[in-house]
Interface confidence: low
């Protein structure tokens, strides 16, 4: 009878999360007769996987019949892999000794590690707006992949973007990995229907990446333009002053109208114009009646666009010298 | 029992490539390392370069053939592929590919493809 | 890279009759798992190379027992305990602790 030689043919295994693993070991020898069990990691903290005699195993098989005579293989099948599972297996041949069994030969172990997919990439903007022209951050983060070898790409409306910086973690051997890549991007006052895209590609994906996706709309803030112009009614009296919001985004607008400094309505936008770029466009009237005027009168606008602060434009309506005389004579 | 065949003879000008092919059938091919072992006549054995098809488009490769050699591999079909640029006569030789457990013990091996270059 | 030294070059054997080769290694093949990373191999005249020996001293399924090897570290033998003449050709030994996996030059085993 030969010498006893464990033989684990396989040193690495590569195994899907959610699949079955075959473990092989095969011995040359039916001596010295004793157990084969098989263990996870060496030394004193090693974990126990399978033991034919005594254990409860639920996820463990046994590839051929242990119990018959003549019976070599020691294969083990693990069902259900998770991240978990990952980790250097070891066959182990005892002998019998006294009170314990006594481990006589170990196999050269078979690492499993484990296939596993990113999870779907998960994109988010900055905290606050921004304005054209400024630089906004978007975060990817996938995790649970393995292997470590990954590739992420970020793309805008289809373009692939290179300022950007990517870590995966952790740097040494894991059973999973994670990644967490941020891009910075341009805005554009146009932006507000733009996406920024983060691609991610892995061994176990067979060539079909995954994408997540964030609206550039949730991360921008284009300011309005304001005019103001007023147009003499029919009456002669009546001055009808109308001021034009355009181009803002998002909605929230609040427009106060002040007259010689005093607030004479507010309103909030409602019935707006939506332009093709996505921002918006509002018209607001009022009708000033100069008849009982004697002064010349300061018009003022005030806008809040999206909690920031208030922007004036204001206007003098000139009251005629005649109306002020008008007005002059009926004080006296 | 596992079965590597390889591509036939090839006969090549000095400075042109080569691209040998190397099919497996009767076990797994994705978990196991396909190594590219060459022959010069009358001379030993020397290992080229191997990949784990499982791991994609990743391959190590000796220093001596490092930018000259490519090692690939295709899953969906089986089939592992060593491209050798810039020959030389000296790269006359038999050119096997070789399956093993990781990236060591060569444990079937294909019958061989011959590459002769010659002006 | 590991350098792989094999003697004898060749070795006239009669049938029946034991041989040896002998293999050094530049640096000990032997793991942290306790195993030796040594493989031997022969190639037939006119064949491809075929495994014999793995880790030192594990015979291949379906070789010949009259086949064994040995050794740890950086000295291993392989052993023919009787020849047949079946067995001559080229015998190598192969490092594979480490890529590049390197090869001995080769034991041109012939009949006497």
């Known amino acids: 009878e030969e010498e006893l030689q464990m033989i684990q043919p396989e040193k690495l295994l590569l195994v899907a999360v959610g699949e079955s693993a075959t473990l092989n070991c095969t011995v040359t020898s039916l001596l010295p007769v004793g157990p084969v069990l098989w263990f996870r990691g060496v030394g004193p903290g090693r974990e126990l996987i399978y033991n034919q005699k005594e254990g409860h195993f639920p996820r463990v098989t046994t590839v051929s019949d242990l119990t018959k005579r003549n019976n070599m293989d020691f294969s083990i099948r693990i069902s259900s892999i998770t991240p978990a599972d990952a980790g250097t297996y070891y066959c182990v041949k005892f002998r019998k000794g006294s009170p314990e069994n006594v481990e006589f030969k170990s196999g050269p172990g078979t690492e499993m590690a484990l296939r596993a997919k990113p999870s779907a990439p998960v994109v988010s903007g900055p905290a606050a707006r921004a304005t054209p022209e400024h630089t906004v951050s978007f975060t990817c983060k996938s995790h649970g992949f393995s292997p470590r070898d990954i590739t992420l790409k970020w793309f805008k409306n289809g373009n692939e973007l290179s300022d950007f910086q990517t870590n995966v973690d952790p740097a040494g051997q894991s059973v999973s990995y994670s990644i967490r890549s941020t891009a910075r991007v341009v805005l554009a006052p146009w932006d507000v229907r733009s996406q920024v895209t983060c691609e991610v590609a892995h061994v176990t994906l067979q060539g079909d990446p995954l994408r997540g996706t964030a609206n550039l709309s949730e991360a921008i803030r284009v300011p309005p333009t304001l005019e103001v112009t007023q147009q003499p009614m029919r009456a002669g009296n009546q001055v009808n002053i109308t001021y034009q919001v355009r181009n803002f985004y998002p909605q929230n607008l609040q427009l106060t109208w002040l007259e010689n400094g005093n607030v004479c309505r507010t309103e909030t936008a409602s019935t707006l114009t939506e332009n093709k770029d996505g921002t918006y466009n509002w018209t607001s009237w009022l009708l000033v009646n100069t008849s009982d005027q004697r002064d010349d009168v300061v018009l003022t606008c005030q806008v809040k666009h999206d909690g920031q602060l208030a922007v004036n434009k204001s206007l003098v309506l000139e009251v005629s010298a005649h109306q002020k005389d008008q007005s002059s004579d009926a004080t006296h | 029992q596992v079965q590597l065949v390889q591509s036939g003879a090839e006969v090549k000008k000095p400075g042109s490539s080569v691209k040998v092919s190397c099919k497996a059938s009767?076990?797994?091919?994705?978990?196991?390392?396909i190594s590219w072992v060459r022959q010069a006549p009358g001379q030993g054995l020397e290992w080229m370069g191997g990949?784990?098809?499982?791991?994609?488009?990743?391959?190590s490769y000796a220093q001596k053939f490092q930018g000259r050699v490519t090692i690939t591999a295709d899953e969906s079909t089986s089939t592992a592929y060593m491209e050798l640029s810039s020959l030389r006569s000296e790269d006359t030789a038999v050119y096997y590919c070789?399956?093993?457990?990781?990236?060591?013990?060569?444990?079937?091996w294909g019958q061989g493809t011959l590459v002769t270059v010659s002006s | 890279d590991i350098v792989m030294t094999q003697s004898p070059l060749s070795l006239p054997v009669t049938p029946g009759e034991p041989a040896s080769i002998s293999c050094r290694s530049s640096q000990s093949l032997l793991h942290s798992n306790g195993y030796n990373y040594l493989d031997w191999y022969l190639q037939k005249p006119g064949q491809s190379p075929q495994l014999l020996i793995y880790a030192a001293s594990s015979l291949q399924s379906g070789v010949p027992d009259r086949f064994s090897g040995s050794g740890s570290g950086t000295d291993f033998t392989l052993k023919i305990s009787r020849v047949e003449a079946e067995d001559v050709g080229v015998y190598y030994c192969?490092?594979?602790?480490?890529?590049?996996?390197?090869f001995g030059g080769g034991t041109k085993v012939e009949i006497k």
């Open positions: 070789a399956r093993g457990v990781g990236d060591d013990t060569l444990t079937d």
């Open positions: 990949i784990i098809p499982i791991f994609g488009s990743t391959a």
């Open positions: 009767g076990g797994t091919f994705s978990n196991y390392a």
């Open positions: 192969m490092q594979a602790l480490q890529t590049p996996l390197t």
